[in-house]
């Protein structure tokens, strides 16, 4: 069923509703070069074919050459994320051209007849990059593409349309209705640049989809399972951004792509990294904090180019505002016997104590089910560097701490009685650090005390044979 | 320098339409959008809706819509803005004011205003 | 639509005096760091001026005893020493989103 849009209506009706009352529009594409950093400015405007422009703008033909690329509006003004994403990449890059594709006119649209002027949009840009390669000293390869939502396909277009490849195209959550599943040459795709990185937070395997939930470049970030972002619940929303409706939920959570490319050029010193893994649930199973043959990389403008050849999907979790960096862990748990478990999966929770700090009670999410004599993988992530870990701390939740637990605790007493306690033994924890890709491990404090029960904690150390580092590399950022 | 020249007072009958014009010099007209205000006798400021001088698509507050149009002329640097079906209600001064595409879109210069008097 | 209450409505001063006017937003005019709230001054039959830009920025030509300041949905406009001139009425004005909306203004006479 489409997601619900309160008294305003659905979403669908909202693609399909333009805010304007308009009369005769002009078609228009405009190229605004932002020649300050202060938002304010008015900035120049480019055409193909006027050179004096880029002169008295200083338009650096040597430097990179950013296009940023805006999507459907409501509004028909520029949203608020363009400045920032503007400022940010002036703080980077401070001799690079930024370029602002102002295609409001189009895109100020029933959603439908938006869609339909991304392929013009691009034209418009490939016939602006076709006229600065007549011009000494300009190259493709210098020139990054940053789209965002329906921006992020009209840059495919424009990829597709130029004579050349650009060198990078960057798409901040593609528009996901009537582009999933397309064919490849109607929305954006790894043939449209040398590299084409991709970051989506807002797919919904439900409802209607604002992002489009298909890898369509060389590797496509999926933050948080590129569902539901931290800090753009209903909740947090209410609190501090304006509305509080689920319009905003929808917003915050479809911007967020813009918020994760932002934080990685302003704090290039924090930055995230993300695992390749095939789907979602596995990353959240812990098994896919691997740096081997370039499993991981760096998210957004520090990412490394890789060109696969097919899709890399890729995951990581984040804070829920910037610097959105975290520290992911692998924790291995090796049961190796338990008693009376009944139908309850038991409810973890691990304190990591470091050298720099100590972490909050994390809990440890069971995506299926806790296996005996195997081997239970679980991710574990914490917002502050703890640096080398020294101990571990395992606690299991005790029944009455949860009313789902408490009841099932009753069923299983009504249906045996004379259930004995429920125990667990754990010898060892094994640890991976997804950020340093070290490895350690936790063995129990008491080594004749391995048992663990509801309302119980226990304890790990470092075991005696300390780091156990394999032939495993970091992931190193290397600026671009 | 930068300046919003407005035209000339009216005086209407209920009913009928008024057309105020809003011209500017001293910077690139197309590169500002023109926002539309009124504030009646006495009263606090409203706005009335914006056009984009570029692409000439303007957008009205809901109190307005159906009732005001807006336009552009790029080649006299020129923004209208035309009231129908008048009330004695619309009695006001009506202020042209540009605001940027960019940045925080405040109203950095205004017209001196244009008085409209509705009555019978 | 974002309300925005001034308060108060009206104050007499004597010149020297500091005046404190402030602005409530019915919802945050804040986007990250930057705040979209503005404030106008406007004398009898004259147009609004701008006095202060993004809640602290002074507009060009702006005395320095005119200062902003406030964040999220609470502003405030400070005239450090009220001048003969500073007489007129004040208004905020949000432009987070359209459409942007105007406080009901607040009156400075002289008391």
């Known amino acids: 069923s489409p997601v619900p849009f309160g008294p305003e209506g659905r979403l669908e009706d909202k693609l399909h509703k333009p805010k304007a009352t308009q009369t005769e529009v002009k078609p228009s594409v405009r190229f605004n070069l932002r020649t300050s950093k202060d938002p304010e400015h008015e900035g120049c405007y480019l055409s193909v074919g006027h050179s004096q422009p880029l002169e008295d703008c200083s338009f650096n033909m040597t430097a990179k050459t950013f296009f940023i690329i805006h999507g459907w509006t409501m509004s028909g003004i520029f949203e608020n994320w363009l400045h920032k994403l503007v400022s940010a990449l002036h703080t980077r890059e401070k001799d690079a051209n930024v370029v602002v594709v102002d295609w409001l006119p189009l895109a100020h649209q029933l959603y439908t007849d938006a869609v339909n002027n991304t392929r013009v949009v691009g034209h418009s840009i490939a016939r602006m990059l076709d006229w600065l390669q007549e011009k000494d000293d300009f190259s493709l390869g210098n020139v990054h593409l940053i789209g965002y939502s329906l921006g992020a396909h009209v840059a495919g277009y424009a990829g597709n349309f130029v004579k050349g490849t650009v060198g990078r195209i960057t798409g901040l959550d593609p528009a996901g209705p009537m582009f999933e599943g397309a064919d490849i040459h109607k929305r954006l795709s790894p043939d449209d640049a040398d590299f084409v990185d991709v970051l989506h937070t807002y797919t919904r395997s439900f409802g209607l989809s604002i992002g489009i939930q298909m890898p369509v470049g060389h590797i496509d970030i999926y933050p948080n399972g590129g569902d539901f972002q931290p800090g753009c619940g209903l909740n947090d929303v209410l609190g501090s951004i304006a509305y509080g409706t689920i319009t905003e939920v929808v917003k915050c959570e479809h911007e967020r792509a813009v918020h994760l490319f932002v934080d990685s050029l302003v704090n290039q010193d924090k930055p995230s990294f993300a695992f390749q893994c095939t789907d979602s649930n596995r990353f959240k199973k812990g098994i896919c904090l691997s740096c081997r043959k370039n499993r991981c990389n760096s998210i957004g403008y520090n990412a490394k180019k890789m060109r696969n050849k097919r899709n890399s999907k890729m995951y990581l979790k984040t804070r829920a505002g910037m610097p959105f960096r975290v520290y992911h862990y692998q924790m291995k748990i090796h049961v190796f016997s338990y008693k009376n478990m009944g139908e309850i999966e038991p409810t973890f929770y691990v304190t990591l104590y470091g050298t720099n700090a100590d972490s909050q009670t994390l809990p440890l999410e069971i995506v299926e089910r806790i296996e005996q004599n195997a081997t239970n993988t679980f991710l574990v992530y914490t917002e502050e560097d703890l640096g080398d870990l020294l101990k571990i701390q395992l606690t299991w939740e005790g029944a009455s701490q949860s009313w789902y637990n408490l009841w099932k605790e009753f069923r299983s007493y009504l249906s045996q009685p004379r259930n004995p306690g429920r125990e667990l033994n754990i010898r060892r924890i094994r640890v991976k650090s997804g950020e340093t890709q070290r490895k350690l491990t936790f063995c129990t404090e008491d080594p004749e005390n391995t048992s663990i029960s509801p309302g119980r904690e226990l304890w790990f150390r470092k075991c005696r044979d300390g780091w156990r580092m394999k032939n495993e590399t970091s992931p190193t950022v290397e600026l671009p | 320098q930068v300046q919003l020249v407005q035209s000339g007072a009216e005086v209407k009958k209920p009913g009928a339409s008024v057309k105020v014009s809003c011209k500017a010099s001293?910077?690139?007209?197309?590169?500002?959008?023109m926002n539309w205000v009124r504030q009646a006798p006495g009263q606090g400021l409203e706005w009335m809706g914006w056009i984009n001088t570029y692409s000439g698509v303007p957008t009205y507050a809901g109190d307005f819509k159906g009732r005001v149009t807006m336009t552009t002329d790029t080649s006299t640097s020129t923004a209208y803005m035309e009231l129908r079906s008048l009330r004695s209600d619309d009695t006001a001064v009506y202020y042209c004011a540009r605001r940027g595409y960019y940045g925080r879109r405040y109203f950095d210069v205004w017209g001196k205003g244009t008085t409209v008097t509705v009555s019978s | 639509d974002i309300q925005l209450t001034q308060s108060p409505s009206s104050l007499s001063a004597s010149v020297g005096d500091r005046v404190t006017i402030t602005c409530k937003a019915s919802?945050?005019?804040?986007?990250?760091?930057?705040?979209?709230m503005h404030w106008y001054q406007q004398k009898p039959g004259k147009a609004p001026k701008l006095l202060i830009y993004a809640a602290s920025n002074l507009a060009s030509g702006v005395p320095s005893r005119f200062s902003g300041s406030g964040s999220g949905t609470d502003f405030t406009l400070t005239i450090s020493s009220l001048q003969p001139e500073d007489f007129a009425t004040y208004y905020c004005q949000q432009t987070i989103e359209d459409p942007p909306t105007f406080g009901g203004g607040t009156k400075v006479e002289i008391k």
């Open positions: 919802q945050s005019v804040d986007y990250d760091v930057d705040s979209y």
């Open positions: 001293g910077y690139t007209f197309t590169n500002y959008g």
